[in-house]
Interface confidence: low
Amino acid sequence: QTPLGMASGHIRDFQITASGQYGQWAPKLARLHYSGSINAWSTKEPFSWIKVDLLAPMIIHGIKTQGARQKFSSLYISQFIIMYSLDGKKWQTYRGNSTGTLMVFFGNVDSSGIKHNIFNPPIIARYIRLHPTHYSIRSTLRMELMGCDLNSCSMPLGMESKAISDAQITASSYFTNMFATWSPSKARLHLQGRSNAWRPQVNNPKEWLQVDFQKTMKVTGVTTQGVKSLLTSMYVKEFLISSSQDGHQWTLFFQNGKVKVFQGNQDSFTPVVNSLDPPLLTRYLRIHPQSWVHQIALRMEVLGCEAQDLY
């Protein structure tokens, strides 16, 4: 786990703001282990928050919190909720794996101890906002955010290298004739041969290609490529992506509140990389071709990293 820079100062003062402050107990002081007579953010306001702008979307997989002392008083936040945003405008409440009510985190029990709360699943956000719900005397906080850079996770997951086995690649259907079988396992980037891509039995937008990673992976992008067969160029121009944790319930990839239509290939040989923002934490991934030239034909790679790399 990597500290994102509250304690080190890598997160600068201007990135830390709050709904208000008590006296000199400013947001910029809300840094884990900060020392001095005034050494934390504090506020008397009941409906308060403190916000950190990470300047770019990051994976945040935990928060360490600490209170502070003022003379003989212990000041700390005992319970809080977390909200997060990619743009600073549209905020979501962190709910963990639940689709129900918000998640209330248990914070500190004294002024000096450090409580580490883990976000499972991790939060992908540029902005993170902590709202105290219960506190001792005043909401008072020193903290560190734990996480990593989104861009540190764009390794090929194994379509081309065959680290992803044939059995892990399936499809709604595949085209076969007496000359060739265009099976799902042929959907590997740069694959060569007589039948060197996946092609469905029929060309329609209901067809899909599926990869089962066999465990939860963080998927940050996909690379797609078409194919040339008997002088005919075939490639997918547009596609959708869906994901699932159980292989039964599928969720289409949304961006800015809309189903994202990915722009694919423009010829049969040039690989095109599409990044997923925010990344997907998923076991299963499906590509749904929506428009194509001549025939649906797909070779691909998935980019990302293992989800446990995040913890």
């Epitope: 409906f47 909720i81 979501q92 719900t133 509140g257 809309k258």
Partner: antibody, heavy 121, light 106 residues
């Protein structure tokens, strides 16, 4: 799924106060965002204010800040709105509404049946 | 908080598509919700987070939100869709509603 049941209709004189209650059942009341929305006869919806029981503090629309008190009792899973210094333009149906998100960014997905408050001399 | 602007009324023939707009400066920066209210009933949530449908809401209801305008689209409008429709968004921690649009199915 949370259900919200409100108290009955009220008829009040101008200058007096009214309190309407809203009892929640079937969910986690404490972290559920409860708001009050009113609708004058033949008019649109107007947000009066809201409360998140775990915060214990209410958030009120600017127009009502001096006249409205919103409270919640976690033990009985009941939210209350009290409106003071009533005037005829406060005549409306008052809805207790809830959302699974503290700030109901997911929309108000649960609505009480409404309580008609009539202010008349 | 400034309110949200909706057309007072929209008319549509059965089976046609109705679009109800809701506008305010930079509304696309906020999440918009939509509600349907039939006479004598409490409003009901139709769309949240711009385009998501709660369970039980028919697929013919869809939403979008960008720029200064959120739009509720009802495709294949039915007589039962005749109702008042309200948009709603949050201005910091204050909820604001549109004035409402009466949808008439001719």
């Amino acid at each position: 799924q949370v259900q919200l049941v409100q108290s009955g209709a009220e008829v009040k004189k101008p200058g007096s106060s009214v309190m309407v209650s809203c009892k929640a059942s079937g969910g986690t009341f404490s972290s559920f965002g409860i708001s009050w929305v009113r609708q004058a006869p033949g008019q649109g919806l107007e947000w009066v204010g809201g409360i998140i029981p775990i915060f214990g503090t209410a958030n009120t629309a600017r127009n009502f800040q001096n006249r409205v008190t919103i409270t919640a009792d976690e033990f009985t899973s009941t939210a209350y709105i009290r409106l003071r210094s009533l005037r005829s333009e406060d005549t409306a149906v008052y809805y207790c509404v809830g959302g699974r998100d503290a700030y109901s960014f997911d929309g108000f997905d649960v609505w009480g049946q409404g309580t008609m408050v009539t202010v008349s001399s | 908080s400034s309110g949200l602007t909706q057309p007072h009324s929209v008319s549509v023939s059965p089976g046609q598509t109705a679009n109800i707009t809701c506008s305010r400066d930079k509304l696309g920066h906020k999440f918009a919700s939509w509600y349907q209210q039939k006479p004598g009933q409490s409003p009901a949530l139709l769309i949240y987070q711009d385009s998501k449908r709660p369970s039980g809401i028919p697929e013919r209801f869809s939403g979008s939100n960008s720029g200064n305008t959120a739009t509720l689209t009802i495709s294949g409008t039915q007589a039962m869709d005749e109702a008042d429709y309200y948009c709603q968004a949050w201005d910091n921690t204050t909820a604001v509603f549109g004035g409402g649009t009466k949808l008439t199915v001719l």
